[in-house]
């Protein structure tokens, strides 16, 4: 129920967060699931626990396996599982699919590529970025905080982008890399007030309690490349990041697509294990560009069970 996949490369740092949430003040104990052996908290160990985080400094292929974390709340011990896989470094430049994070899309005026998982690490700017294993050089590339911005994006900017940074732990440095694909949509055109394609305003979506559901916020902003075009979800008028519900996550990055020549952006809100309280929330799809902001609201309702009757005589 409370399990999470994580992966990394041998000889790199890997930091994993316990899938069970909890207040930052709660003590978290980590164990090797197979042996029930406690993972030490002393930082002199290569693998050690630090609150909600499990640190491999550096990781080895033999570290692969399932790890148990127990969050000690004032009343109960709550258990989660981290499924960790450490892969050997590839001899060539190809990054296999199983090491790739989610693909992001961009355009001439919207070309942010976020470095995945970086928030778990103690790193300092600037990030190093590589495209198809070649270091990015030139004024078109700007490493800004935890993302890369490419000026005047062209179709041949598409490819696999790897961010590389140094994690510092007690004065010792460890390398971390993470790779994701970037696709480019390029077209000249115009900008206009956002038009939200989905959801319809005041729409109601039927969901089943206990199932997972996705809500797509999709809006079009004109034709061709857009300077500013963003869509996002809000819950009860609050940003997703301000909402303390780990089951509800907005897709990192935004996918840009072109529909009948129009520049459309979408982002997906993923709700895991739908609960009754989710039906009480107001889900706002916000579309914003230089012309202004448009908002469409969607609510969830419980799907009525259908009486499946046989049509056979």
């Amino acid at each position: 129920k409370f399990s999470k996949q994580s992966w990394g490369l041998e000889n790199e740092a890997l930091i994993v967060r316990c899938p069970r949430q909890g207040k930052s003040s709660y003590i978290v104990d980590w164990y090797y699931s197979q042996t029930n052996k406690s993972i030490p908290t002393q930082e002199r160990n290569r693998v050690f626990a630090s609150g909600q985080l499990l640190k491999f400094l550096p990781a080895e292929v033999a570290d692969s396996g399932i790890y148990t974390c127990i969050v000690r709340s004032p009343t109960f011990n709550r258990t989660g599982y981290a499924n960790v896989t450490i892969y050997k470094k590839q001899p060539d430049c190809n990054v296999p699919d199983y090491l790739m994070y989610s693909t992001v899309s961009g355009s001439e005026k919207n070309s942010k590529i976020y470095c995945p998982t970086i928030d778990l690490y103690n790193w300092t700017a600037p990030l190093e970025w590589f495209k198809n294993c070649q270091a990015l050089q030139g004024s078109r590339y700007k490493a800004h905080k935890s993302f890369l911005v490419i000026d005047n994006v062209m179709t041949d900017d598409a490819g696999d982008y790897t961010c590389k940074f140094i994690h510092n732990e007690n004065g010792a440095n460890y390398s971390v890399t993470a790779t994701r694909s970037f696709t480019v949509k390029d077209e000249q055109g115009f900008s206009r007030f956002p038009v939200i394609r989905a959801p319809a305003h005041n729409e109601t979506k039927e969901v089943e309690i206990g199932e997972n559901t996705n809500l797509t916020c999709s809006a079009c902003f004109g034709k061709g490349a857009q300077f500013l075009a963003t869509v996002q979800w809000q819950l009860n008028g609050n940003k997703i990041t301000d909402f303390s519900e780990p089951r509800i996550q907005q897709e990192e990055g935004q996918n840009q697509s072109f529909s009948n020549g129009l520049a459309c952006v979408n982002t997906v809100l993923r709700i895991a294990d739908v609960k009754e309280e989710d039906l009480l929330l107001r889900y706002d799809c916000l579309a914003l560009n230089l012309h202004g902001l448009r908002r469409h609201t969607i609510r969830l309702s419980r799907k009525n069970p259908i009486d499946h009757q046989s049509t056979y005589c």
Epitope: R20, Q21, S73, P74, F76, E245, E276
Partner: antibody
Framework: QVQLQQSGAELVRPGASVTLSCKAS????????MYWVRLTPVHGLEWIGA????????AFNQKFKGKATLTADKSSSTAYMELRSLTSEDSVVYYC??????????????WGQGTLVTVSA | QIVMTQSPAIMSASPGEKVTMTCSAS?????MHWYQQKSGTSPKRWIY???KLASGVPARFSGSGSGTSYSLTISSMEAEDAATYYC?????????FGAGTKLELK
């Protein structure tokens, strides 16, 4: 929506026992711990104890350790609290309640309607 | 156990008046929850994690504090705010509540 339906008022003799029930609906019963709280004229709200319906693990306020027994029936999504050796001081309203986000202990967001227990000879 | 002391025990306020009630913990706690209860009804989660308003709570309410000292403030009292307010800590077992502050309409 999330609902906690408690059993009706009870009139019991001093020294006797009583079992209160709390039927949960609108969510997966085993996903959230169930807490029991009482309301007294002197102390206001007091936490009695809690049960994790998934494991049956319990946690108690030491004050109520010999007084209350907590159980849960997964098949009926119902939590129970047995109170024993009742005295007039136990004549108060008892609530079952749960947090909004179980892991983050973000306050008791859902409450039953309460069960009044009256201890009288 | 951590003892929660609420003050004042009873207070009254006129419509439009600013109201502040406090909750003092005998030991440091990491955050505070507040509940509103009206006579004959179940308590309602009102403010959680020290300063977050529960769903449906008017914006005139706010919460603040740290360590052993916390407070609930109503910027402008309204008739519907008359109720008993309880603070509660979830930092240590046993979970404990304050004895409540009864807010009356003047």
């Amino acid at each position: 929506q999330v609902q906690l339906q408690q059993s009706g008022a009870e009139l019991v003799r001093p020294g006797a026992s009583v079992t209160l029930s709390c039927k949960a609906s609108g969510y997966t019963f085993t996903d959230s711990e169930m807490y029991w709280v009482r309301l007294t004229p002197v102390h206001g709200l007091e936490w009695i104890g809690a049960i994790d319906p998934e494991t049956g693990d319990t946690a108690f306020n030491q004050k109520f350790k010999g007084k209350a027994t907590l159980t849960a029936d997964k098949s009926s999504s119902t939590a129970y609290m047995e109170l024993r050796s009742l005295t007039s001081e136990d004549s108060v309203v008892y609530y079952c309640t749960r947090a909004f986000d179980n892991d983050n202990d973000d306050g008791f967001a859902y409450w039953g309607q309460g069960t009044l227990v009256t201890v009288s000879a | 156990q951590i003892v929660m002391t609420q003050s004042p025990a009873i207070m009254s306020a006129s419509p439009g008046e600013k109201v502040t009630m406090t909750c003092s913990a005998s030991s440091s706690v990491n955050y505070m929850h507040w509940y509103q209860q009206k006579s004959g009804t179940s308590p309602k989660r009102w403010i959680y994690d020290t300063s977050k308003l529960a769903s449906g709570v008017p914006a005139r309410f706010s919460g603040s504090g740290s360590g052993t000292s916390y407070s609930l403030t109503i910027s402008s009292m309204e008739a519907e705010d008359a109720a008993t307010y309880y603070c509660q800590q979830w930092s240590s077992n046993p979970l404990t509540f304050g004895a409540g502050t009864k807010l009356e309409l003047k």
